[in-house]
Interface confidence: medium
């Protein structure tokens, strides 16, 4: 059976697969997924290994029409470095010389300057090029190699291993060499995989059942450290509770060097955030941190300085802390918009069982704003999801130059933010450089400001506008309002009408359904339309909703189903990557973000059309 990293190299023109007959003969044969000799896998960014021989594809020289055969894998050799060129060409790195079928006289696979059909290769059984099953570095734990990546294949007691092994061990722990020759270099580490006893790599907090892994002997960049945690179904550490910080202070007290945690300001337009999307509500900075120096976007915990936090350049090499298990956040269920009949008094706007109102004109200090909201039967608004924030931005009449009090504050416990309405903090969205909590002036209250409505801490004594929120009064079944210019069941936003397609459909089926309604799969033109759509679908239980974006027509170039330019994107992390397909919006914790899915997957969808009676604005000129 093929493991997920292995593949057969397939030439569509001949309908045959590459077959390593021997180290000196790499030919083709009828494709057979059970044949070890036809299985290959990437073992570094640029090396392809034969699974049967544990040797790498290479050439004797970078010249036209030389045989491609198998060599002992050597990560430094220029003659074993391959790269995917446009579409399905595979070439020797840095040259216009391609992996080629050979010809009638030449049975062996050859290196050739021609880029025709005989130089085009796919993963057998897919339409993908060979790089779509690329190499993922595996960062080691413990051992003596400072967390370096596994080197596959590696030699141990004169035997080659292409995977982690428990050879030499009686306890079943899986390890790998971090250079190709363990026997000579003696460098190794344990693999970030599940094996008997791997739980002892973690410390479980008995109070919360959350587990932590302290990798103090590693030396990785922030991004490498994060990858290592993710390889163990974990994330870099987030700290949202004082108890959690206390536990970790104890756990790291014998150490001296800094350890990466998940806090970062890597998002271009927002502020400090945890990589696991926990809310940034508890602050434990070292005095003088966070420093505003550009590039210092990642955060380390300093065991030698009472486990306080310091921002550093992300390329520094440090140890790190991973976290897995129950999140420390209280479980707090936000009702889906469709679950709650929402009836609001005049001038209040309904959303998901609550009513909202912006007070823009009567500026008040935070304490007085809170009093006013409470007199009206509510509180300063709490915000628990990206959908709720996007509802406020897109539908409450929020303006880009607004600066409005919300209920978040750290008045009660310094550096520990809470909502004034007592609901748990499950979500934060800080502006770039925030929360700054400048020491020379108390910034204990929080405002929403700027075009995106992100947050900043502020001195509570500033007179500003504010947003109130209250529980709605349920008044029997809700009357479905027909919005002006839209048919029944469609929702209006600006010039358009939108409808959720409730039948699970492939991308093509969804597109057809929209067309049948004289509409099309939704396009998303800007941040504000995205905000509306996020609030429209984000709290629903289904995982995905199709948009009209795909790269069906031209692989690698994403286009809308209607002739409209792609001027805005909202990709989820690691998207779109190299995956071809169709684009759907996520719900839940990644609400609104775009993922590339296989077009024949089934999902719900959003249709869109011009509202009736709306004058079409002129198309923007480029």
């Amino acid at each position: 059976l093929l493991d997920t990293r292995q593949f057969l190299i397939y030439n569509e023109d001949h309908k045959r697969c590459v077959d390593a007959v021997s180290p000196s003969a790499v030919q083709t044969a009828a494709c057979n997924q059970d044949a070890e000799s036809q299985k290959f896998r990437w073992v570094s960014e640029s090396q392809i290994m034969s699974v049967a021989f544990k040797l790498c594809l290479g050439v004797p020289s970078k010249t036209d029409w030389v045989a491609i055969t198998l060599y002992a894998c050597d990560s430094k050799s220029e003659f074993q470095k391959w790269e995917c060129k446009n579409d399905t060409l595979l070439g020797i790195k840095g040259e216009d010389l391609f992996f080629n079928y050979g010809n009638r006289q030449e049975k062996n696979i050859m290196l050739y300057k021609g880029s025709g059909l005989w130089s085009r290769w796919k993963i057998y059984g897919t339409t993908d090029n060979l790089c779509s099953r690329g190499y993922e570095a595996m960062y080691t734990l413990l051992g003596n190699a400072n967390g370096a990546t596994c080197a596959f294949p590696f030699k141990f007691e004169n035997k080659w291993y292409a995977d982690c092994t428990s050879a030499g061990r009686s306890d079943g722990w899986l390890w790998c060499g971090t250079t190709t020759d363990y026997d000579t270099d003696k460098l190794f580490g344990y693999c970030p995989l599940k094996f008997e006893g791997s739980e002892s790599l973690w410390n479980k907090d008995p109070l919360t059942s959350v587990s932590y892994q302290i990798n103090s002997k590693s030396a990785l960049t922030w991004h490498q450290a994060r990858k290592s945690c993710q390889q163990q179904n974990a994330e870099l550490l987030s700290i949202t509770e004082i108890h959690e910080q206390t536990y970790l202070t104890g756990l790291t007290s014998s150490l001296t060097s800094g350890l990466w945690i998940g806090l970062n300001s890597l998002s271009f337009n927002s502020g400090w955030q945890w990589s696991d999307r926990s809310p940034f509500r508890y602050l434990n900075w070292l005095p003088g941190s966070p420093s505003a120096e550009p590039g210092k976007s990642c955060v380390s915990l300093n065991p030698g300085k009472n486990a306080k936090w310091e921002n550093l350049e992300c390329v520094q090499k440090l140890g790190y802390i991973c976290k897995k298990g129950n999140t420390t956040l209280n479980s707090f269920v936000i009702p889906s918009e469709s679950d709650v009949p929402t009836h609001c008094p005049s001038q209040w706007w309904p959303y998901a069982g609550h009513c909202y109102k912006i007070h823009r004109d009567e500026k008040k200090i935070q304490r007085d704003a809170l009093t006013t909201c409470r007199k009206e039967g509510g509180d300063l608004t709490s915000i628990h999801t990206i959908e709720e924030l996007d509802f406020i931005i897109s539908q409450l009449g929020y303006e880009p130059n607004d600066e409005l009090w919300i209920g978040l504050n750290d008045i009660k416990i310094q550096m520990y933010f809470e909502w004034s309405d007592g609901t748990p903090v499950t979500f934060t969205k800080w502006l770039r450089g925030e929360p700054s909590h400048e020491n020379n002036r108390q910034e204990d209250c929080v405002v929403m400001k700027g075009k995106d409505g992100y947050w900043a801490d502020r001195g509570c004594e500033w007179p500003l506008g504010y947003i109130c929120k209250m529980k709605s009064r349920s008044q029997g079944p809700e009357i479905v309002e027909v919005e002006k210019g839209c048919r029944k069941g469609w929702k209006k936003h600006h010039f358009y009408c939108y409808m959720i397609g409730h039948t699970l459909s492939t991308f093509a089926e969804a597109n057809q359904t929209c067309n049948n309604e004289n509409a099309y799969l939704t396009t998303i033109e800007d941040r504000y339309e995205q905000a509306f759509l996020t609030s429209f679908v984000g709290l629903r239980p289904e995982k995905y909703f199709w948009t009209g974006l795909s790269d069906i027509q031209t692989k690698g170039t994403f286009q809308w189903t209607i002739e409209e330019e792609v001027r805005f994107t909202h990709w989820n992390s690691d998207m779109p990557g190299r995956k071809p397909g169709c684009v759907a919006m996520r719900t839940g914790i990644a609400g609104g973000l775009w993922d590339v899915l296989k077009c024949d997957e089934k999902a719900k969808f959003v249709c869109k059309h011009w509202a009736e009676g709306v004058t079409h604005p002129p198309k923007p000129t480029t």
Epitope: L142, G143, A167, G168, R169, S170, Y182
Partner: nanobody, 118 residues
Framework: DVQLVESGGGLVQPGGSLRLSCAAS????????MGWYRQAPGKQREEVAA???????NYADSVKGRFTISRDNAKNTVYLQMNSLKPEDTAVYYC????????????WGQGTLVTVSS
């Protein structure tokens, strides 16, 4: 490296008790688990009991309910309390440490002889 020294063996009557000790020195912070094994004359070495760094224990069926393995982290020592001894418990008892600092996990002591005879 890890060095292991066993003590506490000797001659005991059937039904009697003995307590074996195994003291570890060297890179002891790297020990993941410790165990006791025994080898009777002309037989294969077999596992008797083991204890992990987290305190989980495991026993061979033949000694369950009679033998108890424990550890004293402060003294870097593992013990085997042997009660209700039988003649078939006669063997050389070896201490083993499983370490994580090299791929070669097992370090052994020299062994201590236990003889159960009337």
């Amino acid at each position: 490296d890890v060095q292991l020294v066993e003590s506490g063996g000797g001659l005991v009557q059937p039904g009697g008790s003995l307590r074996l000790s195994c003291a570890a020195s060297g890179s002891i912070f790297t020990i993941n688990a410790m165990g006791w094994y025994r080898q009777a004359p002309g037989k294969q070495r077999e596992e008797v009991a083991a204890i992990t760094s987290g305190g989980s224990t495991n026993y061979a069926d033949s000694v369950k309910g009679r033998f108890t393995i424990s550890r004293d982290n402060a003294k870097n020592t593992v013990y085997l309390q042997m009660n209700s001894l039988k003649p078939e418990d006669t063997a050389v008892y070896y201490c083993k440490a499983v370490v994580v600092t090299t791929p070669y996990s097992d370090y052994w002591g020299q062994g201590t002889l236990v003889t159960v005879s009337s």
